[in-house]
C-alpha cells in the first residue's frame, strides 16, 4: 500500500492576511485565523513529518479583497509560490479581469500547473494561452506518479469574463478523454481537481470513470467528521463518500473558504492504484497555529501599497451621497441606486443574442448601506470612503428565484416598516410601489422589473412562476436581516466579487457620478 | 544526522565579493528555512537574512541589504551567500543555521562551522 | 525591530553553584501564548549551539542543568549546578519577528 496526503483549499477568495472568524477584517489578533502565513506554518509542518503530501488548490484565489484590487493576482502567484503549491484549477474569479488579467499575472508567473480540462481556447487566444494552463498534470510524488485533473465552472461565462475566445465544455463531457489518456500513461491514481461545486464534484466522483478523489471548490461546502471547530456546519462527513456508477467508493473534498481550513485527505492506494481508504479532517487554522515569521514579515511588505491605495481618488460625485440610516432604511436612497447600478454593471455579459443582459434586477439590504459620502471634499471618493460604507467584507452575489420568492422577500421589506430596521430593500431594475395602510404581508400593491430578453428594456409585471436572476448581498442569499425565503428557496446561488471592490470599480469607470432618487421606490398613500 | 558544511575561509581585497557556501545533507533540504549570520569579535551576532530554498523565498535584514544575495540549488542541497562590494567591516564569521520548527518555534537548531572573511589590502 | 538586552556582561560562577542570566526584550516576544525566545550556547572556535527554544524547552541533547524561563519581555537563563564545561558564551535570540535579534552575550566563566 501507498498513503498520499492530499493538503487542499478553495475559494481562498484574497485573503491573505489573517482574519475574524467570520472571514471578515482581522480586529483581535488572538483570535484570527487563516491568512498565508498559518498556512505555510501547517503546511511546512505536515510536508516534514509526512512523506507523500500534495498541496492544492481548487480555484478562486481572486476576487475579495483589497489585496486583489491592487494586487490584480500578483499577490495569488507570489503567495502561492511561496507555499510551494502543486496544483491549482481555474475558478470562475480567476477571469474577473479578463483573460489578460489571469495569464499576465498568474499564469506566466505561477511556478506551479495550473489545470482545467473543460476550457478549450479558440481564434487568436488559442496560441496565446498554449501550454500556460493544461487539462492535467502528472505529478511525481515519492517513488510514484499522481494524475491531477481540471475542472472549472461551465457557468463562468455567466459569472465572470472570460471573453468569446474561450469555450466552458460540459465537465464530465471534457474529463473523461483526459482521465483515459492518464491511463494510457499508465498513470493509476488520479485526482480531479475543480471549480463547480459540490454538487458537480460528487457527479464527476460517480460518473467519470478512473477518478479516484475530487477535490472541488466553488460551493463553500464545509465537510467535516465528528464535532466541527468553528461555527461551520457540516454539508456532510469528510471525506464525502460517493459510489460510481463502476462500483468503486470515491472521496470527495471540500475545504470551505477562505484560507479559514486546510483540507487534509489521507489516500490509501493498493498496488494497482484502487483507493483502499481514505480519512481526514479539515484542520482549522487558528491562532493555535502561530504566523510564519518569515512569510508575515513578506506579508507586510507587500501590504505598504495597499495603505497607500486606500487613499487615493478613484472618483468624484458631484452630489451628496445618502447612506443614511434615516434614508435607505425608510425609502429610495440615491447610495443604494448607486451601489445597485454598480452591481448591475458589474454583470453586464452579452453571451446571448437575444439577451441585452442575462441579469438586470438588484436587491440590497438597507442595512448593509453604513455611511453616506459627502461631496463637499472637493468630491473626491477613496476606498477608505467606500469602506465605512461597506464594511463587512461581503459579496455581491446572482441567485435564480421564483417570481413568488421576490414577492415575499418584498413584504418582508416592509412587514415592519418605520422601525428603522435593515431589511428595507434598495433597488436596481426593479419598480415597486408599496401601500402601507394594508396588513403586513399584504403591502406590495406594484412590483415590476426590467425585462433582460428584450433590446429595449422596460419594465413588465413580476411572474410569481418566472425564474428570475437577480444580483444582491450574500448576507442575503444566506438568509440575513430575516429574509430566510431567499435562503430556503433559491434555485441557484453562485458568489461574487467583493462589494467594495464592484462599487469602486465602477466610480472608477464613471469618473463622475451623480445618482437620483428617481422613483424606483414608491408608496402608494398619500402620507410617504 | 543533520549537517551544514560551509565553504573554507577566504581572504579578499576591498570592492571584491565572495559566495559562500553550505551543503545541508541528512533532512529535506527544500523544507526548512537557511539562516545566514554574521559574528564579529567583540559584535555578537547579527542576523543577515534567510532563504527558504524549495520555494525561493528570501528575507534579508534592512542592515543587509544590497550587500548580501542569497541563493540556493537544490538540486546539490546547497544553499549560498554572496557578500559584494567588501570592506573591513565585512571582515567576520559567517554562518548559515537551519530554522528548525519543532512546535512551529522557529528556532536555528543546526549551524555550520562557520567561515571566516578576511578582507585586507 | 525588537532589541534585546543581556545582563550581565559576564558572570563568574563557582563549580556546583548556580548561574542566572537575564535577557530583556524592547516589547514583548509572546504570540499566541508561545514566548518565542531562545538561548545558544557559544564557545571559542565552534558556532552557536542551541540550548533552549521557546523559552522553558531544552534543544536535543541538552543536559537537564540548563533550564529557561520567563515570558512577554522579562527572560532567563538557569544553569545549575555548573560545570567545567560550562564555560562558554551565552545568547539570547528572539524569533517572534523578521528580523531576528540577538542578545549582546554573556561571558560566563569558574570562578
Known amino acids: 500500500a501507498w498513503e498520499l496526503t492530499i493538503l487542499h483549499t478553495n475559494d481562498v477568495h484574497s485573503r491573505l492576511e489573517q482574519t475574524s472568524e467570520d472571514s471578515s477584517k482581522c480586529v483581535n489578533a488572538s483570535r484570527c485565523m487563516g491568512g498565508v502565513a498559518r498556512l505555510f506554518t501547517k503546511v511546512q509542518q505536515i510536508r516534514r513529518a509526512e512523506p507523500n503530501v500534495l498541496l492544492l488548490d481548487a480555484g478562486d484565489q481572486y476576487q475579495g479583497t483589497i489585496w486583489f484590487t491592487v494586487y490584480k493576482g500578483a499577490e495569488v502567484a507570489h503567495f502561492m509560490n511561496a507555499l510551494r503549491y502543486d496544483a491549482m484549477a481555474l475558478g470562475n474569479h480567476e477571469f474577473d479581469n479578463g483573460v489578460e488579467g489571469l495569464i499576465e499575472p498568474l499564469l506566466k508567473e505561477a511556478k506551479f500547473p495550473i489545470l482545467s480540462a473543460n476550457i478549450k481556447a479558440k481564434g487568436p487566444l488559442a496560441s496565446q494561452i498554449s501550454g500556460l494552463y493544461l487539462p492535467y498534470k502528472v505529478l511525481p510524488v515519492g517513488d510514484e506518479v499522481v494524475g491531477i485533473v481540471g475542472y472549472t465552472s461551465k457557468e463562468t461565462p455567466f459569472l465572470s469574463n472570460p471573453g468569446t475566445n474561450l469555450v466552458f465544455e460540459d465537465e464530465i463531457t471534457a474529463l473523461q478523454p483526459e482521465v483515459d489518456k492518464l491511463k494510457t500513461l499508465n498513470v493509476n491514481k488520479i485526482i480531479a481537481l475543480g471549480h463547480s461545486g459540490f454538487e458537480m464534484d460528487k457527479l464527476i466522483a460517480q460518473k467519470v470513470r478512473g477518478v479516484d478523489v475530487v477535490v472541488g471548490g466553488h460551493s463553500n461546502t464545509f465537510l467535516y467528521t465528528g464535532n466541527p471547530p468553528s461555527k461551520e456546519v457540516p454539508a456532510g462527513k469528510y471525506p464525502f463518500i460517493v459510489t460510481s456508477d463502476d462500483g468503486r467508493k470515491v472521496p470527495v473534498v471540500q475545504a470551505y473558504a477562505f484560507g479559514k481550513y486546510l483540507g487534509y485527505l489521507k489516500i490509501e492506494f493498493d498496488e494497482r492504484g484502487n483507493v483502499i481508504s481514505s480519512h481526514g479532517n479539515p484542520i482549522l487554522l487558528n491562532s493555535s497555529i502561530p504566523e510564519d515569521p518569515s512569510i508575515k514579515a513578506d506579508i507586510n511588505k507587500w501590504r505598504i501599497k495597499l495603505d497607500n491605495y486606500s487613499t487615493q481618488e478613484l472618483g468624484k460625485t458631484i452630489v451628496y451621497l445618502d447612506g443614511s440610516s434615516q434614508s435607505c432604511r425608510f425609502r429610495e436612497c440615491n447610495m443604494g441606486n448607486l451601489i445597485c447600478d454598480a452591481m448591475i454593471n458589474n454583470n453586464l455579459r452579452h453571451t446571448d443574442e437575444m439577451f441585452w443582459n442575462h441579469v438586470s434586477m438588484c436587491i440590497l439590504n438597507g442595512g448593509g448601506i453604513r455611511s453616506p459620502i459627502d461631496e463637499r471634499n472637493n468630491g473626491t471618493i477613496t476606498w477608505e470612503n467606500l469602506a465605512a460604507v461597506l464594511p463587512f467584507g461581503g459579496t455581491f452575489d446572482l441567485v435564480q428565484l421564483k417570481g413568488s420568492t421576490l414577492k415575499k422577500a418584498f413584504e418582508h421589506s416592509v412587514h415592519r416598516y418605520g422601525q428603522s430596521t435593515g431589511e428595507f430593500l434598495q433597488v436596481g431594475g426593479i419598480h415597486v410601489v408599496y401601500d402601507l395602510s394594508r396588513k403586513p404581508g399584504d403591502r406590495v400593491v406594484k412590483l415590476d422589473v426590467l425585462c433582460t430578453k428584450c433590446r429595449v428594456p422596460s419594465y413588465d409585471p413580476l411572474k410569481m412562476d418566472e425564474v428570475y436572476k437577480v444580483i444582491l448581498p450574500n448576507f442575503l442569499a444566506n438568509g440575513g436581516d430575516g429574509f430566510q425565503m431567499i435562503k430556503d428557496e433559491l434555485l441557484r446561488h453562485d458568489s461574487g466579487d467583493q462589494d467594495i471592490n464592484v462599487v469602486s470599480t465602477y466610480i472608477s469607470k464613471m469618473k463622475v457620478i451623480y445618482p437620483a432618487v428617481e422613483g424606483r421606490i414608491k408608496f402608494s398613500t398619500g402620507s410617504h | 544526522q543533520v549537517q551544514l558544511q560551509q565553504s573554507g575561509a577566504e581572504l579578499m581585497k576591498p570592492g571584491a565579493s565572495v559566495k559562500i557556501s553550505c551543503k545541508a545533507t541528512g533532512y529535506t533540504f527544500s523544507n526548512y528555512w537557511i539562516e545566514w549570520v554574521k559574528q564579529r569579535p567583540g559584535h555578537g551576532l547579527e542576523w543577515i537574512g534567510e532563504i527558504l530554498p524549495g520555494n525561493v523565498i528570501t528575507n534579508y535584514n534592512e542592515k543587509f541589504k544590497g550587500k548580501a544575495t542569497f541563493t540556493a540549488d537544490t538540486s546539490s542541497n546547497t544553499a549560498y551567500m554572496q557578500l559584494s562590494s567588501l570592506t573591513s567591516e565585512d571582515s567576520a564569521v559567517y554562518y548559515c543555521?537551519?530554522?528548525?520548527?519543532?512546535?512551529?518555534?522557529?528556532?536555528?537548531?543546526?549551524w555550520g562551522q562557520g567561515t571566516s572573511v578576511t578582507v585586507s589590502s | 525591530d525588537i532589541v534585546l538586552t543581556q545582563s550581565p556582561a559576564s558572570l563568574a560562577v563557582s563549580l556546583g553553584q548556580r548561574a542566572t542570566i537575564s535577557c530583556r526584550a524592547s516589547e514583548s516576544v509572546d504570540n499566541y501564548g508561545i514566548s518565542f525566545m531562545n538561548w545558544f550556547q557559544q564557545k571559542p572556535g565552534q558556532p552557536p549551539k542551541l540550548l533552549i527554544y521557546a523559552a522553558s524547552n531544552q534543544g536535543s541533547g541538552v543536559p537537564a542543568r540548563f533550564s529557561g524561563s520567563g515570558s512577554g519581555t522579562d527572560f532567563s537563563l538557569n544553569i545549575h549546578p555548573m560545570e567545567e564545561d560550562d564555560t562558554a558564551m551565552y545568547f539570547c535570540?528572539?524569533?517572534?519577528?523578521?528580523?531576528?535579534?540577538f542578545g549582546s552575550g554573556t561571558k560566563l566563566e569558574i570562578k
Open positions: 543555521a537551519r530554522r528548525g520548527d519543532d512546535g512551529y518555534l522557529y528556532a536555528m537548531d543546526y
Open positions: 535570540q528572539q524569533s517572534k519577528e523578521v528580523p531576528f535579534t
